[in-house]
């Protein structure tokens, strides 16, 4: 058992049919010495009295809010929450696998730069009784500072007959220097509770290798005198590093129609413009990717071709 | 040490070609060496990440772009030179920060230039000829040297008398390359913002 | 299978056109860029031009213009190529390609060779 | 025009041996460039598009790397049917053009 927070604590349990389950002692937090009672959730029922109790923990029902009384006043409480462990691994039932880029991927997170900031997501089935707490640290061993916010609801969708609902989080490193060279590697922990289910999500990743930039902004088209071929230019998103000069972009440009399978013109720069053939009822579209470092490409700008 | 001499260059800036070349190469010889030694922990996250140059060269913050000189975080380790021109640039006033930033860079690539031959060394000896080290990349370490254009001290290389450990030396492989990688992205940023300065 | 058939080999005359033919099958004609190109004997390639068989939309390479005329009906899944005034620098294997990507070749026709010869 | 130059014109290898073929651009085209394998009396054929990407069907000792202005071509252990003429072509503006041809002979 471990304190989660304060008058929060963690039971972990190996999860089988008859485990034999973990034996808690909970102290009421009193001076008091007599005359003290311990009860479970809403239930009047008296579990024990004295100073202690002691409890064999099982399943999801010994676990709760375990409240101390004297003469009908409240002294304390202790909640227990169950942290399940099946055949030596820890249960991920709260969270969704995202299975991208591999199995058993929780946690997703993204920067648009190097400044040092990020954003993490995850996803879930559950709508009710749940709450996540997240903190971060660049290593483990002697870990540097990561400031993170309060997770937050950012997305609701269908998913077939069940809603899916994505949480985020955003984080910052305290001291980060966009230049510098990552030797050690950010660590993300999140702690996931539903109901009486206690669960904890790591990530572990470089800034570098979570880089996405934001879409090439301000895309503009220029016909070109008895040609098929059009000028596109646009310019770097501005939410990415500077000086550009020394955070440089490489894009990408495609004009496509409607449907993928269409036929295409792609060509790759790491210029701000470039020369396409436009066709009839497609569209121009350019993203971009970090030039000497190949994490992810941005998503899609795009202009229609007419 | 001596500074770098700058040699008018009418073409393009020197540097940044071989800079380019070299991140390519580089990256190619981690590839092979990733889809080589699959059974080996070679990938970014099972690696420890060393910097054989740290406490040695301070490339990143002698090379540190002027707009970033402001930012407090990457002037935390030392007094912070910046970039402003140098030798590869075909100009004759070659600024000592420059000098300071392009003579680190210089010696990142020597260093792993003696690493990798001495890896080479013992990895030609492996019965198993599992791996031996691109002479491509090699070579463009080299290219980029001569254009950085310095004189300094030969460093011997390395001998061992003892037995290799071939896992260890390929283990150290993926170490190096991934560390080089990094460093090797670096050098082309500053490459490429020299370029537009 | 996506296949492209070329029309048999011709010998013209000089200052003659010639008018060669590539016939698809496999996938639908018009979800593909066309293109033509050209290899002198023990010599290299050389792209002529493309078209957009969906709008007849044209491209050809400044080398060729006002000489090329590249053409497609729809009706049959086939493109042709016509190039006048022939000169003797114009013996070749001409060669069709197609892609749904317009930059690049994926399905080339068997080539035809092209003898211009007085 | 883009002038594309490939060296070497010839190249004598052993089969069972690497062979690398390199591909230079007269101006920078970052990655829009294709490579294509022909053998005599044949059309070519599609090895490598945009400069590394693999083509199904296509064995996987071919593989091309560079970005720019120079590029390659790698066979990484050459098999009898890998003797040809291979042409590198840029994509990155009209009129596309291929380089000259590298004949890789048995040596």
């Known amino acids: 058992i471990w304190e989660l927070k304060k008058d929060v604590y963690v039971v972990e349990l190996d999860w089988y049919p008859d485990a034999p389950g973990e034996m808690v002692v909970l102290t009421c937090d009193t001076p008091e010495e007599d005359g003290i009672t311990w009860t479970l959730d809403q239930s009047s029922e008296v579990l024990g009295s004295g100073k202690t109790l002691t409890i064999q923990v099982k399943e999801f029902g010994d676990a709760g809010q375990y409240t101390c009384h004297k003469g009908g006043e409240v002294l304390s409480h202790s909640l227990l929450l169950l942290h399940k462990k099946e055949d030596g691994i820890w249960s991920t039932d709260i969270l969704k696998d995202q299975k991208e880029p591999k199995n058993k991927t929780f946690l997703r997170c993204e920067a648009k730069n190097y400044s040092g900031r990020f954003t993490c997501w995850w996803l879930t089935t559950i709508s009710t009784d749940l709450t996540f707490s997240v903190k971060s640290s660049r290593g483990s061993s002697d870990p540097q500072g990561v400031t993170c916010g309060a997770a937050t609801l950012s997305a609701e969708r269908v998913r077939g007959d069940n809603k899916e609902y994505e949480y985020s989080v955003e984080c910052q490193e305290d001291s980060a220097c966009p230049a510098a060279e990552e030797s050690l590697p950010i660590e993300v922990m999140v702690d996931a509770v539903h109901k009486l289910k206690y669960e904890n999500y790591t990530s572990s990743f470089f800034i570098r290798d979570i880089i996405k930039p934001d879409p090439p902004k301000n895309l503009q088209l220029k016909p070109l005198k008895n040609s098929r071929q059009v000028e596109v230019s646009w310019e770097y998103p501005d939410t990415w590093s500077t000086p550009h000069s020394y955070f440089s972009l490489t894009f990408c440009v495609q004009v496509q129609g409607k449907s993928k399978r269409e036929k295409k013109d792609r060509v790759f720069t790491d210029k701000t413009s470039a020369t396409v053939i436009c066709r009839k009822n497609a569209s121009i579209s350019v993203r971009a990717q970090d030039r000497y470092y190949s994490s992810s490409w941005s998503e899609w700008a795009s202009v229609p071709c007419s | 040490r001596n500074l770098p001499v700058a040699t008018p260059d009418p073409g393009m800036f020197p540097c940044l070609h071989h800079s380019q070349n070299l991140l390519r190469a580089v990256s190619n010889m981690l590839q092979k060496a990733r889809q080589t030694l699959e059974f080996y922990p070679c990938t970014s996250e099972e690696i420890d990440h060393e910097d054989i140059t740290k406490d040695k060269t301070s490339t990143v913050e002698a090379c540190l772009p002027l707009e970033l000189t402001k930012n407090e975080s990457c002037l935390n380790s030392r007094e912070t030179s910046f970039i402003t021109n140098g030798s590869c640039l075909a100009s004759r006033k070659t600024s000592f920060m420059m000098a300071l930033c392009l003579s680190s860079i210089y010696e990142d690539l020597k260093m792993y230039q003696v690493e990798f031959k001495t890896m080479n060394a013992k990895l030609l000896m492996d019965p198993k000829r599992q791996i031996f080290l691109d002479q491509n990349m090699l070579a463009v370490i080299d290219e980029l040297m001569q254009a950085l254009n310095f004189n300094s001290e030969t460093v011997p290389q390395k001998s061992s008398l003892e037995e290799p450990d071939f896992y260890k030396t390929k283990i150290k492989l993926c170490i190096l390359l991934h560390a080089f990688r990094i460093r090797a992205v670096t050098i082309d940023r500053v490459m490429s913002y020299l370029n537009a300065s | 299978q996506v296949q492209l058939v070329q029309s048999g080999a011709e010998v013209k005359k000089p200052g003659s056109s010639v008018k060669v033919s590539c016939k698809a099958s496999g996938g639908t004609f018009s979800d593909y860029y066309l293109h033509w190109q050209r290899q002198a004997p023990g010599q290299g390639l050389e792209w002529m031009g493309w078209?957009?068989?969906?709008?007849?939309?044209?491209e050809y390479a400044p080398k060729f213009q006002g000489r090329v005329t590249i053409t497609a009906d729809e009706s049959t899944s086939t493109a042709y190529m016509e190039l006048s005034s022939l000169r003797s620098e114009d013996t070749a294997v001409y060669y069709c390609?197609?892609?749904?990507?317009?930059?690049?070749?994926?399905?080339w026709g068997q080539g035809t060779l092209v003898t211009v010869s007085s | 025009d883009i002038v594309m130059t490939q060296s070497p014109l010839s190249l004598p290898v052993t089969p069972g041996e690497p062979a690398s073929i390199s591909c230079r651009a007269s101006?920078?085209?970052?990655?829009?460039l294709h490579w294509y394998q022909q053998k005599p009396g044949q059309a070519p054929r599609l090895l490598i598009y945009f400069a590394s990407q693999s083509i199904s069907g296509v064995p996987s000792r071919f593989s091309g790397s560079g970005s720019g202005t120079d590029f390659t071509l790698t066979i990484s252990s050459l098999q009898p049917e890998d003797f040809a003429t291979y042409y590198c072509q840029q994509s990155n503006s009209f009129p596309l053009t291929f380089g000259q041809g590298t004949k890789v002979e048995i040596k």
């Open positions: 390609a197609r892609n749904k990507e317009l930059r690049y070749f994926d399905v």
């Open positions: 078209i957009d068989p969906e709008n007849g939309d044209t």
């Open positions: 101006q920078s085209i970052s990655i829009n």
